[in-house]
Interface confidence: medium
């Protein structure tokens, strides 16, 4: 229904705390360089204004759209052009073009230092002194680094952060309590960030229809007892919610997400038997719980998929009458039977089925033509199954770090033109798939592996799009979202690449490496590995192993030496010479 004042309506629905959090996220995602203090001032002004509109919906400007109100606030920032350059040009536009312009200027790789977690004691002190400000900083720092982070989910992670600090800051060994718990929250949040970026990419590049197909497949896997119309209702709502968040309508997005959770909890009987535990929780936890819900049990009496979609004599008639609905029912029926498949695979199968009907229904004997379609699915199913098998075996053999290195070599050979930091980031993330998925039961491995890889590769595409350097990457990234992962998997060594000349300084290290945390040490070594491959793209596994082993020994030896600087200075050139020789 229409409201006189949109901002008053959202304030009342969301409550002050969530309203302020969401406004802070919105501003931080639009203007990623502004300090916290500047944003929090704007948030307070917007909140005060919203309160006046709650008191009197007819007050001046209360009837303006939220985009107009937010945009006017952002455009009033002094020195906007000095800090943001051409983003300031957006302010000359009218809504909705102005908001579109802001969205286009979101930076997926902002030039911000990595978020450093303070010492446990310092964290607890600032948390206890001002929890609201502490959590505000958290929202600001995450949102500006991840401008597409799903806002209501970020509020949930802030709540988790709050819980961990509340619990651990009373312990005697604060660090021992905080570190593993905050690491777990961080890991989940980083995965959530790449997953949501993939959803926004899907929406931006391929529109609502493609996203809705993704949602139908996902919902059908989770809720196999729900009827098709119920699944499409949920998919329609989820599509709307994601469109709003991806489009910067964070208040509407969070409000609609809460509404959907309410609907699901009121209609458990027609959706799933697994919802009750989620429905007893407060709003943020309820929505998150529902988003992560385990699959309901598949109905025992499901007939073969072939009955309606291959053997039925009216397949072509049903398809012709309403293509979208018929293909939707196919996707629903196939997905509810296959929680063990990735959504990407299910969408590839639906695409294959559609192409088969398009071809066969125009021929003289359609049933003979489409009669073998299910058998033709087999290679499409086998390909990702083999991918999971070989990669999980490799992960089990090498461990996470070794597996990351294998992936790094593979991807540097596929796309050596891509910048080393981007390759290292992608390989480290791709390599985490082992830890995340390979330890799961067999039936959960494929969906975990492929859908996670797709999200990570989307991040690679988003970064590459900013500065395109590899034709092969551009080709894989330009195609359909569901074909990306198979496209990258199929890439081989780029034969057109002219190897990088050997630069000694790239492989020159100093004693500062010794004091780095393990993760940073790994990144240094992986940076060197990528550079080695760029120098020698056809180096064998054994050659690379020799050089990297030598390098690890060198670092280890010099970090244990009494005069570290001297060791690095004298041993370094020897290492470089040996490496050149080993790779000759």
């Amino acid at each position: 229904e229409a409201h006189k004042s949109e901002i008053a309506h959202r304030f009342k629905d969301l409550g002050e705390q969530h309203f302020k959090g969401l406004v802070l996220i919105a501003f931080s995602q639009y203007l990623q360089k502004c300090p916290y203090e500047e944003h929090i001032k704007l948030v307070q002004e917007v909140t005060d204004f919203a309160k006046t509109c709650v008191a009197d919906e007819n007050a001046e400007n209360c009837d303006k759209s939220i985009h107009t109100l937010f945009g006017d606030k952002l455009c009033a920032i002094p020195k906007l052009r000095d800090n943001y350059g051409e983003l300031a040009d957006c302010c000359a536009k009218q809504e909705p073009e102005r908001n579109e312009c802001f969205l286009q200027h979101k930076d997926d790789n902002p030039n911000l230092p990595p978020f450093q977690r303070p010492e446990a004691e310092a964290m607890c002190t600032s948390f206890q002194e001002n929890p609201t400000s502490f959590l505000g900083h958290y929202l600001h720092e995450v949102a500006r680094r991840h401008p597409y982070f799903y806002a209501p989910e970020l509020l949930y992670y802030a709540e988790k952060y709050n819980e961990v600090l509340t619990q651990c800051c009373t312990e005697s060994d604060k660090a021992a309590c905080l570190t593993p718990k905050l690491d777990a929250v961080k890991e989940k949040a980083l995965v959530a960030a790449v997953r949501q970026r993939m959803k926004c990419s899907s929406m931006q590049r391929f529109g609502e229809r493609a996203f809705k197909a993704w949602a139908v497949a996902r919902m059908s896997q989770r809720f196999p007892n729900a009827e098709f119309a119920e699944i499409t209702k949920l998919a329609t709502d989820v599509t709307k919610i994601n469109k709003e968040c991806c489009h910067g309508d964070l208040l509407e997005c969070a409000d609609d997400r809460a509404e959907l959770a309410k609907y699901m909890c009121e209609n458990q009987a027609t959706i799933s038997s697994k919802l009750q535990a989620c429905c007893d929780k407060p709003v943020l936890q309820k929505s998150q719980c529902l988003a992560e819900i385990e699959h309901d049990n598949i109905p025992a009496d499901l007939p073969s998929i072939a009955a309606d979609f291959v053997e039925d004599k009216e397949v072509c008639k049903n398809y012709a009458e309403a293509k979208d609905v018929f293909l939707g029912t196919f996707l629903y029926e196939y997905s509810r039977r296959h929680p063990d498949y990735s959504v990407s695979l299910l969408l590839r199968l639906a695409k294959k089925y559609e192409a088969t009907l398009e071809k066969c229904c125009a021929e003289g004997d359609p049933p003979a033509c489409y009669g073998t379609v299910l058998a033709e699915f087999q290679p499409l199913v086998e390909e990702p199954k083999n991918l999971v098998k070989t990669n999980c075996e490799l992960y089990e053999k090498l461990g996470e770090y070794g597996f990351q290195n294998a992936v790094l070599v593979r991807y540097t050979q596929k796309a050596p033109q891509v910048s080393t930091p981007t390759l290292v980031e992608a390989a480290r993330n791709l390599g985490r798939v082992g830890t995340k998925c390979c330890t799961l039961p067999e039936a959960q491995r494929l969906p975990c592996v492929e859908d996670y890889l797709s999200a990570i590769l989307n991040r690679l595409c988003v970064l590459h799009e900013k500065t395109p350097v590899s034709e092969k990457v551009t080709k894989c990234c330009s195609g359909s979202l569901v074909e990306r992962r198979p496209c990258f998997s199929a890439l081989t060594v780029d034969e057109t690449y002219v190897p990088k000349e050997f630069k000694a300084e790239t492989f020159t290290f100093h004693s500062d490496i010794c004091t780095l945390p393990d993760k940073e040490k790994q990144i240094k070594k992986q940076t060197a590995l990528a550079e080695l491959v760029k120098h020698k793209p056809k180096a064998t596994e054994d050659q690379l192993k020799t050089v990297m082993g030598d390098f690890a020994q060198f670092v280890d030896k010099c970090c244990k030496a009494a005069d570290k600087d001297n060791c690095f200075a004298t041993e370094g050139p020897n290492l470089v010479a040996r490496s050149k020789e080993a790779l000759a």
């Epitope: 009827e227 119309a229 119920e230 209702k233 329609t236 009987a269 609905v325 029912t329 029926e333």
Partner: nanobody, 119 residues
Framework: EVQLLESGGGLVQPGGSLRLSCAAS????????MLWVRQAPGKGLEWVSV????????YYADSVKGRFTISRDNSKNTLYLQMNSLRAEDTAVYYC????????????WGQGTLVTVSS
């Protein structure tokens, strides 16, 4: 016992409008998705439109998109089909049906109401 009673059919000129109603009883209407199907003389059943239990979303066969609107009033246990810009090829017996738990098959339908579009 499930009962579905359609009404509102009749003779109408091309370009004209009609509103069909379907009174439902014997099952929980507000938790059931519903649809309209039709059967033209000498032809098979063709589905026309589906509506979710809550009223949205709705789906239409390509042949009626933009001309027909399905709606429901859960407080009255009634399903509606507003038909505008009617064409000769819309001539058929229209049935309302309870949507099944899966697949585009129809669990129950009424006795139907005849719509004739002719000048």
């Amino acid at each position: 016992e499930v009962q579905l009673l359609e009404s509102g059919g009749g003779l109408v000129q091309p370009g004209g409008s009609l509103r069909l109603s379907c009174a439902a009883s014997g099952f929980t209407f507000d938790t059931s998705s519903m649809l309209w199907v039709r059967q033209a003389p000498g032809k098979g059943l063709e589905w026309v439109s589906v509506i979710h239990q809550s009223g949205t979303p709705t789906y239409y066969a390509d042949s009626v998109k933009g001309r027909f609107t399905i709606s429901r009033d859960n407080s009255k246990n009634t399903l509606y089909l507003q038909m505008n810009s009617l064409r000769a090829e819309d001539t058929a017996v229209y049935y309302c049906a309870k949507f099944p738990s899966s697949r585009m098959k129809f669990d129950y339908w009424g006795q139907g109401t005849l719509v004739t579009v002719s000048s």
